[in-house]
Interface confidence: medium
């Protein structure tokens, strides 16, 4: 494959990367705010 | 050399169905996730749906506008990417464009025209 | 959803001049080492065609008097010297998460 693309591999795995983070950031806030709720 | 060949287009009455294929070439397709761009006439661009690899379970994507009437899919064995596209409405009247990756590349595109 | 507002809306430039077009993202698009934003040039009647990838990446076969810069949540292509050519709607677009989404356009015109 030409170059143009060859980037698009690690641009392919920095975003699963990124959604992965996202997903994981979003857990933790939800369970912050569980914990927090809970507490009350 | 890299080729993107959209086709299925055509004129369709609202609440109808068409299914758009991509047909890729001089690249390895089943490598890189794919989408489809639409563009209404005389307008800007608008990201219509993605789909990624056999690794990622063939994860797709889609945008608000179209979610739950449009599926894409693809066969890496043929190389090809699809649309299918139900329950149409005259505001998905616009040139559909296949593209490779992060957006890199384009096909010269495939008009759908929803009217009555 | 992001949004990616251009400015200006239409430019017109004389030949050999510089020509310069802004994108502003409505939240940052960027990571410490990547900036996910992309610039597109369309001619009537074409597809769009990739000019610079990741903010800053010129595409292959691209002349080098395309430039683009930034960060965060502001873009800028720059075409030091404008050609005839270069007539064409330009737009930018981010691919930081889903969905994806594209500025309005900025037409572009020799003066």
């Known amino acids: 494959d030409n170059p143009s693309l060859s980037i698009d591999l690690t641009f392919h795995l920095l975003r699963t990367l990124l959604e992965l983070a996202r997903t994981q950031s979003q857990r933790e806030r939800a369970e912050q705010n569980r914990i927090i709720f809970d507490s009350v | 050399e890299m080729q993107l060949v959209e086709s299925g287009g055509g004129l369709v009455k609202p609440g109808g169905s068409l299914r758009l294929s991509c047909a890729a070439s001089?690249?390895?397709?089943?490598?890189?996730?794919m989408n489809w761009v639409r563009q209404a006439p005389g307008k800007g661009l608008e990201w219509v749906a993605e789909?990624?690899?056999?690794?990622?379970?063939?994860?797709?994507h889609y945008a608000e506008s179209v979610k739950g009437r449009f599926t894409i899919s693809r066969d890496d064995s043929k190389s090809t990417v699809y649309l299918q596209m139900n329950s149409l409405k005259t505001e998905d009247t616009a040139v559909y464009y296949c593209?490779?990756?992060?957006?890199?590349?384009w096909g010269q595109g495939t008009l759908v025209t929803v009217s009555s | 959803d992001i949004v990616l507002t251009q400015s200006p809306d239409s430019l017109a430039v004389s030949l050999g001049e510089r020509a310069t077009i802004n994108c502003r993202a409505s939240q940052s698009v960027s990571t410490s080492t990547y900036n996910y934003m992309h610039w597109f040039q369309q001619k009537p009647g074409q597809p769009p065609k990739l000019l610079i990838k990741f903010a800053s990446n010129l595409e292959s076969g691209v002349p080098d008097r395309f430039s683009g810069s930034g960060s965060g949540t502001d873009f800028t292509l720059t075409i030091s010297s404008l050609q005839a050519e270069d007539t064409a709607v330009y737009y930018c677009?981010?691919?930081?998460?889903?969905?994806?989404?594209f500025g309005q356009g900025t037409k572009l015109e020799i003066k």
């Open positions: 001089g690249f390895t397709f089943s490598n890189y996730w």
């Open positions: 593209t490779v990756g992060t957006l890199v590349y």
């Open positions: 677009q981010h691919s930081w998460e889903i969905p994806y989404t």
């Open positions: 789909i990624r690899l056999k690794s990622n379970n063939y994860a797709t």
